[in-house]
């Protein structure tokens, strides 16, 4: 479970077609 103080930070993961991009790479979203 994520710590409460972390909740407003973006979480970054590897994914494909994410973050408005066509290729695979890191994507950080709140």
């Amino acid at each position: 479970r994520r710590r409460r103080r972390d909740t407003h930070f973006p979480i970054c993961i590897f994914c494909c077609g994410c973050c408005h991009r066509s290729k695979c790479g890191m994507c950080c979203k709140t």
């Epitope: 290729k23 790479g25 950080c28």
Partner: antibody, heavy 121, light 106 residues
Framework: QVQLVESGGGVVQPGRSLRLSCAAS????????MHWVRQAPGKGLEWVAV????????YYADSVKGRFTISRDNSKNTLYLQMNSLRAEDTAVYYC??????????????WGQGTMVTVSS | YELTQPPSVSVSPGQTATITCSGD??????ASWYQQRPGQSPVLVIY???KRPSGIPERFSGSNSGNTATLTISGTQAMDEADYFC??????????FGGGTKLTVL
């Protein structure tokens, strides 16, 4: 100016521990993901670990998982690498590197000067 | 997974140097390139396949498709002599670097 300065390297015996530090200046440290990358003498680059914005959002290379711990103290603008159960193959220059700004931080845009870690009996 | 680079590339001053990086489905990932001069730390020269960070000369360019990413240095200068490393993400826990290519400017 933007700067990363590593410290804490040295000679250590196999099985022992060492903690590296990376002091950041010239940018808003808390707004960037931070990496550790190492380079064995005369060899190529090897990614070690990354810590993103949240303390819980961190990843490790298989070669160090369970032995190394990456952490950050945003109040001190400092990145850390706690290295336990060190092996001879961990001998390398250890660089801290800043992840690119933005929602898609694929590259390492700022690098420190590196600190040498030698694991030897 | 692994990224494969030629160990060395030689070029005459003013000519074009081409450094390749090969890996499984590399063209489906974003490739970055780093320059490392002897005794110095790496410097980012290309990211997201084709983009140049501010301060990097226009003679550096990149491409990436299929299984191969390419770094091209046009009008190569003596100061470009260095090791060059490609890099790409294959998962959240697998960031790969190529073995490096030593560029010699003859």
């Amino acid at each position: 100016q933007v700067q990363l300065v590593e410290s804490g390297g040295g000679v250590v015996q196999p099985g022992r521990s060492l903690r590296l530090s990376c002091a950041a200046s010239g940018f808003t440290f808390s707004s960037y993901g931070m990496h550790w990358v190492r380079q064995a003498p005369g060899k190529g680059l090897e990614w070690v670990a990354v810590i993103w914005y949240a303390e819980s959002n961190k990843y490790y290379a298989d070669s160090v998982k369970g032995r190394f711990t990456i952490s950050r103290d945003n109040s001190k603008n400092t990145l850390y690498l706690q290295m336990n159960s060190l092996r001879a193959e961990d001998t390398a220059v250890y660089y801290c590197a800043r992840a690119q700004e933005g929602i898609a931080p694929d590259a390492f845009d700022i690098w420190g000067q590196g600190t040498m870690v030698t694991v030897s009996s | 997974y692994e990224l494969t680079q030629p160990p060395s590339v030689s070029v005459s001053p003013g000519q074009t140097a081409t450094i390749t990086c090969s890996g499984d489905k590399l063209g489906e990932r974003y490739a970055s390139w780093y320059q490392q001069r002897p005794g110095q730390s790496p410097v980012l020269v290309i990211y997201q396949d084709i983009k140049r960070p501010s301060g990097i000369p226009e003679r550096f360019s990149g491409s990436n498709s299929g299984n191969t990413a390419t770094l091209t240095i046009s009008g190569t200068q003596a100061m470009d002599e260095a090791d060059y490393f490609c890099q790409a993400w294959y998962s959240s826990t697998n960031v790969l670097f190529g073995g490096g290519t030593k560029l010699t400017v003859l």
